[in-house]
């Protein structure tokens, strides 16, 4: 066959679907690879062809669209399973072509089993709620396009294994789940089960997401440098190791880049000829506030190094701060026989 622009296996879109549930999968060509949509392609006389490779096989085979009850079908640029089976797992390819043009992409589809408490190997999206922030909602994800707006599905919400009924601060409202005031105790996995009829059959869509309660923007502050501070003096003799920790607390801020860096005499440590190493560690609180520690280390400090300015800097979306470490050279203790004796008037 003639040359085809092959975008390869698009592992960035590892699609996971539950066994025995409907799944609608759009051909990724139009979403991520080509500059035109399906309608334009179709009206230009291009045809969309689907095929697949079963799990642990190398052989590409056509998809059987003649299964009972149209279990697998194609509609425009969407491949439909009504419902999926475990052995539908494999790599699926959509190819757009006519006599002069060809483009194709493959993507992995994994059909996943779940237990009665909705536990499964499915990768779960995380939804962050601000702690004690007033009413916040989560919405049952990825259910658009499964049924027409004229169909009114039933939606049941679960926290873990338990149906959400008469919960103190969590109220199901159809496709939405409202948290009246989010608390740490609301952390966990939430599942919506959407049930709808189609052609005399009943289908279920199961969607699970993880709720993580995080620090509220109402309580967010600029970075706080705990160390270095004015109470600690790093007093060293030449030849000793100088270790200065910079410990910074960052409030949780959605999509904020937290950064900590040292300057030595106003320069990036790499830019000056000192044998300096910097090691970083990061820890998080239950509400995802962050504490970063960068330890600046000079193995054998010189008297020149002890005169330098060591400043820790920190920045988040809330602001930038800096703090200098107090570094000084230790005054050697007097040698009794000479210095002290002279002090007593000995000659």
């Amino acid at each position: 066959s003639e040359r085809c622009d092959d975008w390869g296996l698009d592992t960035m879109r590892q699609i996971q679907v539950f066994e025995d549930e409907p799944a609608r999968i759009k051909c990724p060509l139009f979403e991520h690879f080509l500059k035109f949509n399906y309608s334009t392609a179709h009206s230009a006389g291009l045809t969309l062809i689907w095929y697949w490779t079963r799990q642990d096989r190398d052989l590409e085979e056509p998809i059987n669209f003649r299964l009972p009850e149209n279990r697998i079908s194609k509609e425009k640029d969407v491949l439909w399973f009504r419902p999926t089976l475990l052995n539908d797992t494999g790599n699926y390819t959509c190819m757009l072509r006519n006599t002069t043009y060809c483009s194709k992409v493959a993507f992995p589809l994994e059909v996943v089993q779940k237990d009665s408490c909705f536990n499964s190997p499915m990768k779960l999206p995380v939804h962050k709620l601000y702690i004690e922030y007033g009413i916040q909602r989560i919405t049952c994800p990825n259910v658009d396009g499964y049924f027409p707006s004229s169909v009114k599905p039933t939606i049941t919400w679960y926290m873990g294994c338990y149906k959400i009924q008469n919960f103190n601060n969590v109220i199901p409202e159809g496709m939405n789940l409202s948290f009246l005031i989010a608390l740490i105790s609301n952390n966990g996995n939430y599942t919506c089960v959407v049930t709808y009829p189609e052609n005399g059959r009943t289908f279920h869509l199961t969607r699970t997401l993880t709720v993580k309660v995080v620090g509220s923007p109402k309580n967010a502050v600029p970075p706080v440098i705990h160390s270095p501070n004015d109470h600690v003096v790093y007093e060293k003799e030449p030849g000793e190791e100088l270790l200065i920790p910079c410990t910074v607390y960052f409030s949780f801020l959605m999509d904020s880049r937290n950064e900590v860096w040292w300057t030595i005499d106003g320069k990036k440590p790499d830019d000056i000829t000192i044998d300096v190493t910097i090691n970083e560690s990061i820890s998080h609180s239950r509400t995802e506030d962050e504490t970063r520690t960068q330890i600046l280390s000079i193995k054998k400090v010189t008297s020149e190094d002890l005169k330098r300015s060591y400043v820790c800097h920190a920045r988040s979306a809330k602001g930038e701060v800096a703090k200098a470490a107090k570094v000084k050279q230790k005054v050697p203790a007097p040698r009794y026989t000479v210095e002290l004796a002279c002090g007593f008037g000995a000659t």
Partner: antibody
Framework: QVQLVQSGAEVKKPGSSVKVSCKAS????????MNWVRQAPGQGLEWMGQ????????YYNEKFKDRVTITVDKSTSTAYMELSSLRSEDTAVYYC?????????????????WGQGTLVTVSS | DIQMTQSPSSLSASVGDRVTITCRAS??????LAWYQQKPGKAPKLLIH???SLAEGVPSRFSGSGSGTDFTLTISSLQPEDFATYYC?????????FGQGTKLEIK
């Protein structure tokens, strides 16, 4: 606002020394590098050296290393550049210029504020 | 020491023109490059630092690009006040070097 005010023009004999001052105001003097740059008549810019006032650390252009000394007086927020063994080719406008401390976001040490320049003429 | 080479050394252009000046470093300087404008009898003025960050108060017709060894200053539409000499400078490590300058003259 940030200001760098330099001392007045100087006329010097070959073999002598010159000391140019640069008084800083409108920012925290100790935490920014102070650079010295010169420009001979009709020529380009030439970096001479820099000092970090908080610690007194200084770096010099190899070309001037033996003849130039940069110092600061923290109490008056003033930087000084002394050039010794003057020759006629040292006739130039001498500028002081501030450069910021390194920032993770803004990168290195661009010269963001400049003095008005001091003309030093070396002539016998 | 890192050498900075600017081109062209001079160029003539008209008001409204798009102008490009290039600067090449003798070794990689990451994005540590600044551009300055100097008018006769005046101190240089910082236009761009860190290769593409516009300095405070500089009009948006000035832009910088590049990283590693090759850098460009572009003036999208020349204004009468833009006729001057332009210098690049690497601001990296413990020594700073300027390019030899590009004189931008009215055609």
């Amino acid at each position: 606002q940030v200001q760098l005010v330099q001392s007045g023009a100087e006329v010097k004999k070959p073999g002598s020394s010159v000391k140019v001052s640069c008084k800083a105001s409108g920012y925290i003097f100790l935490t920014y590098w102070m650079n010295w740059v010169r420009q001979a008549p009709g020529q380009g810019l030439e970096w001479m050296g820099q000092i970090f006032p908080a610690s007194g650390s200084a770096y010099y252009n190899e070309k001037f290393k033996d003849r130039v000394t940069i110092t600061v007086d923290k109490s008056t927020s003033t930087a000084y550049m002394e050039l010794s063994s003057l020759r006629s080719e040292d006739t130039a406008v001498y500028y002081c210029a501030r450069s910021g401390p390194y920032s993770y976001y803004a990168g290195g040490y661009a010269l963001d504020y400049w003095g008005q320049g001091t003309l030093v003429t070396v002539s016998s | 020491d890192i050498q900075m080479t600017q081109s062209p050394s001079s160029l003539s252009a008209s008001v409204g023109d798009r102008v490009t000046i290039t600067c090449r470093a003798s070794q990689s300087i990451s994005s540590y490059l600044a551009w300055y404008q100097q008018k006769p009898g005046k101190a240089p003025k910082l236009l761009i630092h860190y290769a593409k960050s516009l300095a405070e108060g500089v009009p948006s017709r000035f832009s910088g690009s590049g990283s590693g060894t090759d850098f460009t200053l572009t003036i999208s539409s020349l204004q009468p006040e833009d006729f001057a000499t332009y210098y690049c400078q690497h601001h990296y490590g413990t020594s700073l070097t300027f390019g030899q300058g590009t004189k931008l003259e009215i055609k």
